[in-house]
Interface confidence: low
């Protein structure tokens, strides 16, 4: 999908590649002379649709699901974005310039132009992984962003990952060949669901309150420096380091991949002709040309690879999973032919793995990656990809072993460091995770500049009491990952009003608030009755958000679905809520009772999305000792009164009373979301 910077991809002639086909030829000359228009990209298939956003029909009933406490860490304490397999395709001109030097690796450009209608995308996929989420799972996605001219409210990722894990030669098609992989480390299962930062434009952008200086923060009380809290050492001048430095790496010229074996060199003209068709976007003709070459020369690896690429292209054009499965099969066929050049073998299997992930076939992708590592045991980037493969199926132990092996050989590999740090943090080895996450981000290596790593590093630092956490949040904000230092949700719609605390009038949901406050005793009594009769319906928080204490919840609605079993325990409350679709229809939120016992502290944490606001109705509130901080303002609950806050801002809870605290949590759509957005935004 990317708008390719050909100068970087193709070396010196790249600047003359005016028609965007990857070479300098007559067409380019025409463009440069003003005789022909520059080419533009066709919309490509938004790959995040590879996993259906809507919940699968056969999903476990809500009452059987692990409950998502405050539901924040659920998607968020975890999900990380990384550029998976960079540049799987090959320049068409590789055939013409087989032994020439290659240019600098392409910088991925992550503004993608595309239509985002859900219905037009690939038909329903069959992911091999569960759609449920608990705490630390890994997700895969391909990054796309919204075509702003379309009134589409699909969630789009704008995570910025310009680089990639292995700079091999790029195909110039406007593909996002490097599926961004979002990881949510789950304890037990992997989830394949895109992480997104919705590219939805709302005309009026209201700056968050932290745009204005706050003279006194309740949270940050030490030296007010925008720079690190600890003393610094000067960074020594650059020495002759090897290629751990990404800038140095870029300077090391990679050899042009050799894609033709001896036989293929004899049919080079025919291969070139077919490849030219593919490059020109004449996909159906190219498919036929390569099919004919495969028929004529069944032992030709390059012809087979060309056929696979064409099928890959066709799958996108037709938005067909069936065609894509064929491409995946053909990439495999390439690898099984005799006398396949090593470079071609690697490209073919990497692309196969990538496309398998696109379809949600994580285990199949893992097998492909394992084979790649066996074939190319000295390629660190493949080992890094293998680590991701394990994370995607929830096998953190094997992933950890892979990254330990990488770091034992290349101790300065930033990609391995951030992932290793991530795994340590998922295992609750908070302090141990910090240096790996920090050094990994600081390395600047491809795949390390990602919001989730900043999120985890900051979170780990907060948990060990290191105020430098805010430096990393600030840096994450400045690098485009967070809306602000305080607002660090990752599933966002751009331009929504951002403030930590809201009044009922500001939300527009005054009727709902009135109804909750008028009926608070009814709501309270039903909650207390469930506590007395069916304690098992209150499930403990299981997302590692507590420093200490006891905190449970009883969920009535989740992801816009009513939990019928739970509503039997609180029938009047459920009936009351049915009148308010802004909450019952809020597929990015929940409605639930929340009980917190004395001696509980909930770590500072951030919700997953800016698309909802959270109402807290006080039901049983001890006289003192219970408080909630959102951003830099701390408040207390009152029985029968509603507090409203935006949980995409950092918040923290203390329960130091002498008896339990019971509140009723009601999530509502952010009031600035349009009806269409509310209908089309995928559930969280």
């Amino acid at each position: 999908f990317d708008l390719v910077d050909y100068e970087e991809v193709l070396g010196k002639l790249g600047i003359y590649d005016a028609d965007g086909d990857g070479d300098f030829d007559v067409d380019d000359a025409k463009v440069l002379l003003g005789l022909k228009e520059r080419s533009t990209s066709e919309p490509a298939v938004p790959p995040e649709e590879a996993e259906p956003h809507t919940e699968p029909e056969e999903q476990v009933p809500v009452e059987a699901e692990p409950q998502n406490i405050e539901d924040e860490a659920k998607e968020q304490i975890q999900s990380l974005l990384h550029e998976m397999v960079h540049a799987e395709h090959v320049e068409g001109e590789d055939l013409q310039q087989e032994d020439g030097p290659t240019g600098e690796p392409q910088q991925e450009d992550d503004e993608f132009l595309m239509a985002t209608d859900v219905d037009d995308r690939f038909e329903t996929l069959e992911p091999e992984v569960s759609h449920e989420e608990t705490e630390h799972s890994y997700h895969v996605e391909e990054t796309v962003s919204q075509d702003c001219n379309q009134d589409m409210e699909e969630m789009m990722s704008e995570q910025e990952n310009p680089d990639s894990s292995e700079p091999v030669v790029e195909d110039e098609r406007l593909h996002h060949d490097t599926d961004d992989v979002t990881y949510q480390v789950y304890e037990e299962q992997a989830v394949y669901e895109p992480l997104e930062n919705e590219g939805i434009e709302i005309t009026e952008v209201t700056a968050p309150p932290e745009d204005n200086p706050v003279e006194d923060s309740q949270v940050i009380v030490e030296e007010v420096s925008i720079f690190p809290v600890e003393e610094q050492q000067e960074v020594p001048p650059e020495t002759n380091r090897k290629t751990d430095d990404p800038e140095q790496k870029a300077k090391v010229k990679k050899k042009k991949p050799k894609l033709l074996n001896k036989f293929d060199k004899t049919i080079k003209a025919e291969l070139d002709a077919a490849e030219k068709l593919r490059k020109r976007g004449k996909i159906e003709e190219a498919v036929n040309a390569f099919k004919e070459l495969v028929r004529k020369y069944p032992q030709s690896p390059r012809a087979r690879y060309g056929k696979a690429q064409c099928e890959d292209d066709l799958a996108e054009k037709r938005r067909s999973n069936e065609v894509l499965r064929g491409a995946i099969e053909t990439y495999q066929e390439v690898a099984s032919l005799p006398d396949v050049p090593a470079d071609l073998l690697k490209l073919s299997l990497k692309r196969r793995s990538d496309r398998q992930q696109f379809l949600g076939h994580m285990r199949g992708s893992l097998l492909t990656l394992q084979r790649l590592v066996q074939l190319f045991p000295n390629d660190t980037s493949l080992k890094n990809d293998l680590g991701v493969g394990y994370l995607l199926i929830g096998d953190n132990d094997n992933a950890k072993k892979v990254y330990e092996e990488v770091l034992s050989v290349t101790p300065n590999d930033g990609f391995a460091k951030v992932h290793y740090g991530f795994i340590l943090k998922a295992q609750n080895k908070i302090a141990e995770s910090i240096p790996y996450l920090k050094e990994g981000i600081e390395s600047g290596d491809p795949g390390t500049d990602d919001g989730r790593f900043y999120f985890h590093l900051g979170d780990a630092m907060q948990r060990v009491g290191n105020k430098e956490a805010y430096k990393w949040y600030e840096l994450g904000h400045k690098r485009g990952h967070f809306a602000s230092v305080w607002q660090r949700s990752l599933y966002n719609v751009n331009g929504l009003k951002a403030q930590p605390w809201w009044t009922p009038k500001e939300t527009g949901y005054t009727e709902l608030v009135k109804s909750l406050e008028r009926n608070w005793k009814l709501i309270r009594d039903e909650g207390l009755a469930v506590m007395d009769k069916a304690k098992g319906l209150f499930l403990p928080e299981d997302e590692n958000l507590r420093e200490k204490g006891d905190w449970s919840q009883f969920t009535l609605w989740q992801q816009g679905r009513r939990n019928e079993n739970a509503c039997k325990g609180a029938p009047k409350t459920c009936t009351l809520l049915e009148k308010f679709p802004e909450t019952t229809g809020c597929r990015r939120g929940q409605i639930k009772y929340s009980i917190m016992h004395p001696g509980t502290h909930v770590w500072p944490h951030t919700g997953p999305t800016n698309c909802r606001l959270r109402m807290h109705l006080g039901l049983v509130i001890p006289k003192e000792g219970c408080k909630i901080r959102c951003a830099n303002e701390t408040r207390t609950w009152e029985e029968g009164k509603v507090l409203i806050f935006d949980d995409s801002f950092e918040h923290e809870v203390w329960q130091d009373a002498s008896s339990f605290r019971l509140i009723f949590i009601v999530d509502v759509w952010h009031p600035e979301l349009t009806p269409q957005q509310r209908r089309s935004l995928p559930a969280i």
């Epitope: 600081e442 400045k478 830099n632």
Partner: antibody, heavy 125, light 115 residues
């Protein structure tokens, strides 16, 4: 009203030294990082130093490291820039500025939101 | 390496709308930048901070005629109903912290002439 007033510029010979200062008023000086920025005769702006609010941390581009020293006296609300081993390419107008705020408040902490009038430095024999 | 690219000059008729571009290098395309205005014989003045999503916060005393927007690696400063006092050099800047070291880079500036 935020005010930044530079002083101490002048004509210096190559290899010489110079220390100039910036007096701040109208805001809580000790809460802000403070940078120096210079503007070459060709009107190009170049950041040359930043010091953190408490003075513990100093930052320089490689082009001036070792020759320029930024410091501050929060009691006097004053920022300083010491220049040594001056070269002709150091000829410029030097501005002090205020750079953002601290964690958790303004997210404008990289922005140089107020600037002084500048003090001119000419390095010539 | 952090790099900002600006065209060197632009001319606009009085009362027209102007749109200036500052382009980040691809690797840093998500970064938040700042715009500054420098009128003849005056120090630079902070105009706004501009994020990748186009949201922006303007500095003190900046008229409503100034707005910002973003597209990809491009950051735009728009001036509607341009006035003689808007004749100035407009400079973009961006900061980052790399391996514990702070850096701040300015673009070359665009000289705006009001005809």
């Amino acid at each position: 009203e935020v005010q930044l007033v530079e002083s101490g510029g002048g004509l210096v010979k190559p290899g010489g030294s110079l220390k100039f200062s910036c007096a701040a008023s109208g805001f809580t000086f000790s809460r802000y990082a403070m940078p120096w920025v210079r503007q070459t005769p060709e009107k190009r702006l170049e950041w040359v130093a930043t010091i953190s609010s408490g003075g513990s941390y100093t930052y320089y581009p490689d082009s001036v490291k070792g020759r320029l020293t930024i410091s501050r006296d929060n009691a006097k609300n004053t920022l300083y820039l010491q220049m040594s081993s001056l070269r002709s390419e150091d000829t410029a107008m030097y501005y002090c500025a205020r750079q953002g705020n601290y964690y958790g408040s303004s997210h404008l902490y990289y922005a140089m939101d107020y600037w002084g009038q500048g003090t001119s430095v000419t390095v010539s024999s | 390496q952090l790099v900002l690219t600006q065209s060197s000059s632009a001319s606009f008729s009085l009362g027209a709308s102007a749109k200036l571009t500052c382009t980040l290098n691809s690797q840093h395309r998500a970064y938040t930048i700042e715009w500054y205005q420098q009128q003849p014989l005056k120090p630079p003045k902070y105009v706004m901070e501009l994020k990748k999503d186009g949201s922006h916060s303007t500095g003190d005393g900046i008229p409503d005629r100034f707005s910002g927007s973003s597209s990809g690696a491009d950051r735009y400063l728009s001036i509607s109903n341009i006035q003689p006092e808007d004749e100035a050099i407009y400079i973009c800047g961006v900061g980052d912290t790399i391996k514990e070291q702070f850096v701040y880079v300015f673009g070359g500036g665009t000289k705006v002439t009001v005809l």
